[in-house]
Every structure is written in C-alpha cells, then in structure tokens.
C-alpha cells in the first residue's frame, strides 16, 4: 500500500436541492470490491456503514454536509468531496425580476434582481439546464445579479432562492421562473476568459459553466461573456459563496 486510497465520489440523486417532503438518495461510489463504506453527516458528526443513504421524505434535519470514505483491508481512503444537501421550500419563494426588462438587446446590460419577503442575506441564481449556480449576499435584502454585455447564450429560464447565512442548507422555495430573451443579431466573437481574469473553482472546470468574477455592492462588475471555445450552451454561473458584506 503506497499512499492513501483514492477518494470516492458522493452524489445526490436526482439532485442535491431537495424540496421538503420529496425523496433523495445519496450514493458513495468507490472502486470495485470495497470492504466497507462509511457515510458521514457533519455537524454533528455521525455515520452509517453503508454506501448509500435513502431519505424517503426530506426534512430540515436531513439538510447539511455529507462525505464518505471506504475501507479496503485495514486502509481507509481519502474522504470524498463534501456534498451539500439542501432542503428547499423551507421559506416562501422570493420574486425574480429583470431590469430594465427581460427582453434585452444583445450587447446591452441587464440586472436580475431577487427579492425576499424575509431579511435574508444570501441569494442564489440558477439557470435552467445548468449544474452551476451563482451565489452572493446582499445587505439590503435583495440581490442584484448584473449581466454585462449580454449575448445569446444568456437567453433562458432563471430562478432564484433566498436563505439565511445562519442556516445555509435551508432554502426558500424557488422563485417563479423568469425567461430572459436576448434579441438582435449575433455580434463579434466575445473575449476568451483567462485564469487571471476569473477565479477557477471546481465547478468552473465542468463544461457549460463559466465562472463569474467576485462582485460586491461597491465593486464595478466585470464583463461576463460566453466564449465560443470549450463552452456549450446553456450558459451558467459557477457556484460561488461570499460572506456577508464582502
């Protein structure tokens, strides 16, 4: 045995965003012929010696961080990447609107605004068909997601969620969908993002996800453009999280 065993993967099926009352299965996948799997839930730490966890009815208490490992002989693997299991529908849905309009000429700017009826400090924006999300806090209980120099790839259906940073795995119901329509002819090819321009995250390495720049309420947002190289639409936002007030 040279070095630790490689880490397994931990996935939630059908999704890690689970409406209250719905079912979900967490599955730990390691190499063939594993002697023992250990699936852990964090905070507080507890474990089951199984490669899966079936949750027939999602409850608030099921939300949180999970990880898994496996044992071969007397050796343990590295732990999987942590999986965040999120309960949705815990709070009433926020509203999502586009400013100045949900019909945007190509090359113009648009801001998607998520507003919660509660004093929540965290908001998440999802685009239908993408695995990534864009999260950021906003002090004034509404999150502005600026999209600068809109391209055709930004067209699509968006939803947002809101939650409190003190309970980061308990989310609201999703907002009603907002359909963003990009009008006008295609412009010249957009710039290709570089590693200097964009933070590289785990999710940004996946196809069809382009990372966004860190944006705070006082910073001028960067241009976010879809590159024709290596990105297949639909276009999405990388999953990023910022502490309140950053």
């Amino acid at each position: 045995q040279s070095g630790p065993l490689p880490k397994p993967s931990l996935q939630a099926q059908p999704s890690s965003l689970v409406p209250l009352g719905q079912s979900v299965i967490l599955r730990c996948q390691g190499p063939p012929d594993v002697d023992l799997y250990r699936l852990e839930k964090l905070k507080p730490e507890k474990y089951e010696d199984q490669d899966f966890l079936f949750i027939p009815t999602m409850e608030r208490s099921n939300a949180g961080r999970y990880r898994c490992s496996y044992q071969n002989g007397s050796h343990w693997s590295l732990p999987s990447d942590q999986l965040e299991l999120i309960a949705t529908g815990v709070y009433a849905k926020p509203s999502l609107s586009a400013h100045p309009s949900s019909a945007v000429p190509q090359g113009r700017d648009v801001t998607l605004k998520c507003q919660s009826p509660y004093s929540f400090d965290e908001f998440v924006l999802y685009k239908e068909g993408d695995t990534g999300s864009y999260k950021r806090p906003e002090k004034w209980y509404r999150a502005n997601f600026p999209i600068i120099t809109v391209t055709a790839a930004h067209s699509g259906t968006y939803r947002c969620y809101s939650f409190s940073s003190s309970s980061p795995y308990l989310w609201s119901a999703p907002s009603d969908p907002l359909v963003l329509v990009v009008t006008g002819l295609s412009a010249t090819p957009s710039q290709v993002p570089t590693e200097e321009s964009f933070p590289v995250t785990e999710s940004s390495r996946r196809p069809s996800i382009l990372p966004t720049n860190k944006i705070s309420t006082t910073e001028k947002p960067m241009n976010i453009t879809a590159s024709p190289e290596g990105l297949s639409p639909p276009f999405g936002f990388a999953h990023q999280h910022y502490a309140k007030g950053n």
């Epitope: 023992l36 730490e45 507890k46």
Partner: antibody, heavy 123, light 112 residues
Framework: QVQLVESGGGLVKPGGSLRLSCAAS????????VSWIRQAPGKGLEWVSA????????QYAESVKGRFTISRDNAKNSLYLQMNSLRAEDTAVYYC????????????????WGQGTLVTVSS | QSVLTQPPSVSGAPGQRVTISCTGS?????????VHWYQQLPGTAPKLLIY???NRPSGVPDRFSGSKSGTSASLAITGLQAEDEADYYC???????????FGGGTKLTVLG
Amino acid sequence: QVQLVESGGGLVKPGGSLRLSCAASGFSFGDYYVSWIRQAPGKGLEWVSAIGGSGSAVQYAESVKGRFTISRDNAKNSLYLQMNSLRAEDTAVYYCARHYREFRWHYYYFDYWGQGTLVTVSS
Amino acid sequence: QSVLTQPPSVSGAPGQRVTISCTGSSSNIGAGYDVHWYQQLPGTAPKLLIYGNSNRPSGVPDRFSGSKSGTSASLAITGLQAEDEADYYCQSHDLGAHVWVFGGGTKLTVLG
C-alpha cells in the same frame, strides 16, 4: 438501565493469549457499535478496537493490529477481545464502551462504559 | 504520545474557574470532528461529561461547559468543588485512519 460488565482479565506471560468478554444488558445490543478502550496503570485512555452492530465492520488501533481480534455474539449480548502475542506494554485496565446511537446514525463518542478488567502481562 | 494534547495538570481553589485545553490537528478536530470530554474520578471508569463540543448529558451540572474552535477545544469548570477533583480526557475522531483518539488526560486538583 444500560450495563456493561467486563471479565476475563488476569496475569499472563509475554507471548501468551487471553480472551476478554463484555456482557451487555439494558439495551438492544445488536444495534450499537461497541469498542474496547484501555488504560495502562497511571496513564491515559487509549482506544483499542471497535466493531459495528452486525460484526462485519471492525477497526483496530495500529498498536494491536494483527495481534488482537474483536468479535461479538448478538444472541448472547456479548463482546469479545481475543488478545494474542501479548506484550508487557499491553498491561492495562480494559474497558468496553458503547457508542451513542440515534435513529439510524452512530456517533463518535462513548455514552456508557463498563467498570473494566485488569490485564497484567509479566513474566 | 497522545494524538490530542492536554496539559498534564491544572488546579484551582473552591469556587474558582478553571479551563482545560485540548489541541488536535487538521485530521481530527480541524477536520470538523466534534470533541467530547470524559471525567474519571479516582478508581472508577470514565464517564461522559460533554459531547458534541458543548452539550451536557442529563445529570451533569451546568458548571461544566465545553467549546471548540479550529483545531482545539476547551473544557471550563466554574464554581469549583472538591468532588470535581478527577482526571479529564478529551476525545475526537481521526479522519485519516478513522480511529478514535484521546488526549493524554489532565489531573484537576482542588486546592485547600
């Protein structure tokens, strides 16, 4: 109420063998992880070995791996520790302890302990 | 040598407050695992005192409290009493080999 009672300790020569037992009562024994934990005279606590409820999941401290074997008989509500190739440094009070459990989950701490049994390895 | 580090001894007068530290590493306490504390009175088996960093089992007086931060934890005892004189052990879990780990123990002496 929950009770754990160890037995089988005694004086043994280096290289010898001994089998410890722990009789459990007051709870559904087969649902719980249980561990052996030892304490050398005047020293601190050292976890030795753990076994899952069905007996298929077992773990050992590096210091006893290959020499000690943990097992259980759920029909008899009993936990065992077979100790072979004993060394002077294995001299200690051996405790069995139950891991806390809630619903389907096991936790990483010990909520009940036995009173211990003394193992002395000396020529 | 124990995986978790505790001071060998602490002391205090009756009524005083004492704290016992427990320092681990990134593979145990720092990996997110909770810290638990046990009290061992002279000649007896250890007894669970604090679980999950700061929770007290029923029957444990609220003079005992625990906390955790980063790779370390601490146990605080206020209003020290003569019957608190005992050995105190911290315990956690290690992610690398999935083993249970203890501190070396701290002997609390109540003066006077």
